[in-house]
């Protein structure tokens, strides 16, 4: 008896539900009364769930598992695991016995995204070039253990004098603390990137340190070197800072935010007063922070049309400006898969598989692969259409000649968010099964 499971580990986020796919090929005349099905932990053989004597025998695993009773007769023995925990990670064996028997093991890889790192500085006052400072980067509640990278404002890796520690809490989630010791130059940006190696999720933060200098009257305007990435519909902060000279008061400040290319006014502050938003009433300054040299702009309810470069122009006695890029993004939905034709399929038939994913930005990259993970590049047609909001719907069509059976996976990647959404369909000649939605 051939029992089939995915070759790749099933990745599940902590707290979500996961489907461990398993299928078998029932012979003609098969009835559920003949089915004996066991799910167990591969290493310890601990019982997880079973089906015997025509009946679901229930969960033996903290009441968090379920079969798909309506699909069993078609050979779908998949297991639903609810409220996934770190402790669930490992290999699960699907054992099927009718007349013949067979088994296969599927790996569950548990993951949890790391929080946006918080950065602290010690000491954090009266810094001068040549001082040694300790920068701590902390990120919480991720799994598995993170990879931590430090770099300067030019993107050059900083590897010396870094100490990283990771501690697991009772749920098995890790808190990561990474400490960088540096000698300050004239000024510098230090970035910490916390990567989840399973999710390929990067969480990063940076701190810009501008040591005090003897006052020259010069206004140095600083913005992040990297684009600010903002999800459609959320709020974004375009950071901008300047170095106020001693005795500076807000009455002296003249601040303009404008679109870099067209010079269209976005927001301004002059004559000691916030002159308000000139940009659809969706912008705001941080009035309590202006006196300390924080000229950052809050942009609310970000739209695709906001993408581009914004210039922060500061004039006191001296003046200066700098431009910051806003990169807008929207995650793609989980792809839906359709099949044409979808009945009476035989080896040798040509089928058209359509993979559709909606409302993402920017344009997606689409990849097809077979059950073994081998890329399928021939006979693929992908189209992307933007709606009125500028969000893309992607439709990718794969034409294949069926073998005896096969799994076809479609992966829709958002190149900015590095977010992958995937769907798959398994075709087994007669009958055909769609894996349950994860």
């Amino acid at each position: 008896l051939e029992v089939q499971v995915p070759e790749d580990p099933v990745v599940a986020l902590v707290g979500t539900d996961a489907t461990l796919c398993c299928s078998f090929s029932p012979e003609p005349g098969f009835s559920l009364a003949q089915l004996n099905l066991i799910w167990q932990l591969t290493d310890t053989k601990q019982l997880v769930h079973s089906f015997a004597e025509g009946q679901d025998q229930g969960s033996a695993y903290a009441n968090r598992t379920a079969l798909f009773p309506d699909l069993l007769a078609q050979g779908n023995a998949s297991l639903r695991l609810q409220r996934v925990r770190v402790a669930d990670e490992g290999s699960f064996t699907c054992f099927v016995s009718i007349r013949d028997f067979g088994s296969a093991a599927v790996s569950l890889q548990v993951a949890a995204p790391y929080s946006k790192p918080s950065m602290t500085l010690e000491p954090n006052k009266d810094l001068r070039p040549g001082d040694t400072v300790t920068i701590t980067c902390s990120s919480y509640q991720g799994y598995p253990e993170a990879e931590v990278f430090w770099q300067d404002g030019q993107g050059v890796p900083l590897t010396g004098n870094v100490t990283t520690s990771q501690m697991a809490n009772e749920q098995g989630l890790f808190d990561v603390h990474s400490i960088l010791r540096v000698v300050l130059g004239a000024n510098g940006t230090y970035s910490c990137l916390v990567r989840n190696p399973v999710l390929q999720q990067d969480a990063h933060s940076s701190v810009t340190i501008t040591p005090q200098r003897s006052p020259t009257g010069a206004v140095e305007v600083q913005v992040p070197e990297d684009p600010v990435v903002a999800l459609v519909g959320t709020d974004a902060t375009l950071r901008c800072s300047f170095s106020p000279e001693p005795g500076f008061s807000l009455a002296q400040l003249n601040l303009i935010w404008q679109l870099t290319d067209t010079k269209q006014l976005v927001h301004s502050f002059t004559e000691g007063r916030d002159q308000g938003s000139a940009y659809a009433n969706r912008t705001a300054l941080f009035p309590d922070l202006l006196a300390q040299g924080n000229a950052s702009l809050r942009l609310q309810r970000v739209r695709v049309a906001d993408e581009g470069s914004f210039t922060c122009f500061v004039s006191i006695r001296d003046f200066g400006s700098a431009a910051v890029s806003l990169q807008v993004a929207a995650p793609y939905s989980k792809p839906s898969m359709t099949l044409e034709p979808n009945k009476d399929l035989r080896p040798g038939d040509t089928v058209t598989i359509t993979c559709s994913s909606y409302r993402g930005y920017p344009e997606a990259e689409v990849f097809w692969q077979d059950g073994q993970g081998v890329p399928l590049t021939g006979n693929v047609t992908t189209s992307q259409m933007a709606n009125e909001q500028g969000l893309f719907d992607v439709h990718s069509v794969l034409r294949v000649v069926l073998g005896a059976n096969g799994t076809y996976s479609c992966l829709v990647r958002n190149p900015v968010l590095q977010q992958d959404a995937h769907g798959s369909v398994t075709i087994t000649g007669q009958p055909m099964t769609f894996p349950p939605e994860a």
């Epitope: 009257g217 305007v221 004039s315 001296d318």
Partner: nanobody, 113 residues
Framework: LVQDGDSLRLSCAAS????????MGWFRQAPGKEREFVAA????????YYADNMEGRFTISRDNAKNTVYLQMSSLRAEDTAVYYC????????????????WGQGTLVTVKP
């Protein structure tokens, strides 16, 4: 006095203060017209600001070692005829005359058609 299409560089030297601590600007006043902003440069020279219709033909620069600010003008035309003033910026917008504390006496540039 220059010909239409010529180039010209104006210089303005300052004394009696810390030149490198101040932003500087150029203005001009054509016959019978109001004085208008041309360009400004920040104290260290890292930022420049131009009137919309001047950018491209005019370039402002400075040499803090020589306490001097320059205005390079190219493709001059008759309508560029004016008295050109150099000024030391105080508090305010670079394009506003009221932001400038000290002014030069001005130099007349005449562009012959």
């Amino acid at each position: 006095l220059v010909q239409d299409g010529d180039s010209l560089r104006l210089s303005c030297a300052a004394s009696g203060g810390t030149f490198s601590s101040y932003a500087m600007g150029w203005f001009r006043q054509a016959p019978g017209k109001e004085r208008e902003f041309v360009a400004a440069i920040s104290s260290e020279g890292g930022s420049t600001y131009y009137a919309d219709n001047m950018e491209g033909r005019f370039t402002i620069s400075r040499d803090n070692a020589k306490n001097t600010v320059y205005l390079q003008m190219s493709s001059l035309r008759a309508e560029d005829t004016a008295v050109y003033y150099c000024a030391v910026k105080g508090v305010g917008w670079p394009q506003e005359q009221a932001s400038y504390d000290y002014w030069g006496q001005g130099t007349l540039v005449t562009v012959k058609p």
